[in-house]
């Protein structure tokens, strides 16, 4: 029997290599059974995850999964960092793994590095 617990399908240690100035959609895939839970995004600041208020978010529905989307319009260098989505379900909080945005500021990059080059430069997180 399928579990009816809410599940948030963000892979552990996942990341996205993106560029400042581009639009980007960060998706939180949500599995639920009857009632869609309330979902929020937060950004990690050390060990604290700070709720993102007043940001453009939307839902996308697919066959057996819903996606809670955080929109970056456009991506800013300050969007660099790790994000987590959380679902409020039956008075419990279910947290996703964090996913990291590696943002390259195109002003300072002579050419766009590849995904693999980005992933091998984790210090970009702290620049």
């Amino acid at each position: 029997k399928e579990s009816c617990d809410v599940q948030l399908y963000i892979k552990r240690q996942s990341y996205h290599s993106i560029f400042a100035g581009d639009p980007f959609k960060l998706e939180c895939p949500v599995k639920y059974c009857a009632h869609r839970p309330q979902v929020t995004w937060c950004k990690l600041n050390g060990t604290t995850c700070v709720k993102l208020e007043g940001r453009h978010t939307s839902w996308k529905q697919e066959k057996n999964l819903s996606f809670f989307i955080l929109h970056f319009e456009p991506v800013l260098p300050s969007d660099n960092g790790s994000y987590r989505c959380s679902a409020n379900f039956l008075s419990a909080i279910i947290e996703s793994h964090s996913t990291t945005l590696y943002v390259t500021d195109v002003k300072s990059a002579s050419e766009r590095p590849s995904k693999d080059e980005m992933a091998s430069r984790p210090w970009l997180l702290y620049s």
Epitope: Q7, Y9, I10, K11, R12, Q13, S14, Y15, H16, S17, T47, E95, H97, S98, K115, D116, A119
Partner: antibody, heavy 119, light 112 residues
Framework: EVQLVQSGAEVKKPGESLKISCKTS????????IHWVRQMPGKGLEWIGR????????KYSPSFQGQVTISADKSISTAYLQLSSLKASDTAMYYC????????????WGQGTLVTVSS | EIVLTQSPGTLSLSPGERATLSCRSS???????????LNWLQQKPGQAPRRLIY???KLDSGIPDRFSGSGSGTDFTLTISRLEPEDFAVYYC?????????FGQGTKLEIK
């Protein structure tokens, strides 16, 4: 039935390159990370790197960075390990492993591909 | 990188006995999500490894319950409560908390 079926044994000459495949079935490859692991004759296991078939993102061990290329084609549920400029010291068994990316609820291993590099 | 040190290198026991294998990490394997990503693998001669235990103590599907894992932080143990003939093999611990992921050097469990 869950399966990870790797391509067959290879004998190569130094300087040549090689691409090993790992065909998965019985689960959605997009829900996993595909790892590649080396085992030299009579030795232990060494982690080469990991690919996320959902988006192509790859992480390498510093020991293997620049020597190998890991990739996947999610449309045919197959992962690849490319070895370039082969040396005799690349002679080893190479394994793929598929671990569920969310909660690690499964961890399956391929049968291994024996690569022999000899002049 | 994280160094995993397994002990003993070789363990000689008889069927029916209890086996205790150790894996010590050079740093804590506790991830920031509060979980500890430490696996135990079994490898028999001429075969691929197979996962026995993940997240320190969770038993893989189809693995007999005579296998158990315990520990936290930097010290981990694989216990086989009552050895069966098919348990004699090489056992590896593997951490996938910190990049690059690393394996222990293995413990060979042999028949006494």
């Amino acid at each position: 039935e869950v399966q990870l079926v790797q391509s067959g044994a290879e004998v190569k000459k130094p300087g040549e390159s090689l691409k090993i495949s790992c065909k998965t079935s019985g689960f959605n490859i997009k829900d996993t990370y595909i790892h590649w692991v080396r085992q030299m004759p009579g030795k232990g296991l060494e982690w080469i790197g990991r690919n996320d078939p959902a988006n192509g993102n790859t992480k390498y061990s510093p020991s293997f960075q620049g020597q190998v290329t890991i990739s996947a084609d999610k449309s045919i549920s197959t992962a690849y390990l490319q070895l370039s400029s082969l040396k005799a010291s690349d002679t080893a068994m190479y394994y793929c492993a598929s671990y569920e990316g969310y909660y690690e609820r499964f961890g399956y291993w391929g049968q291994g591909t024996l690569v022999t590099v000899s002049s | 990188e994280i160094v995993l040190t397994q002990s003993p290198g070789t363990l000689s026991l008889s069927p029916g006995e209890r086996a205790t294998l150790s894996c010590r990490s050079s740093q804590s394997l506790l991830d920031r999500d509060g979980k500890t990503y430490l696996n135990w693998l079994q490898q028999k001669p001429g075969q691929a490894p197979r996962r026995l235990i993940y997240l320190v103590s969770k038993l893989d599907s189809g693995i007999p319950d005579r296998f158990s894992g315990s520990g936290s932080g930097t010290d981990f143990t694989l216990t086989i409560s009552r050895l069966e003939p098919e348990d004699f093999a090489v056992y590896y611990c593997w951490q996938d908390t910190h990049f690059p992921y690393t394996f222990g050097q293995g413990t060979k469990l042999e028949i006494k």
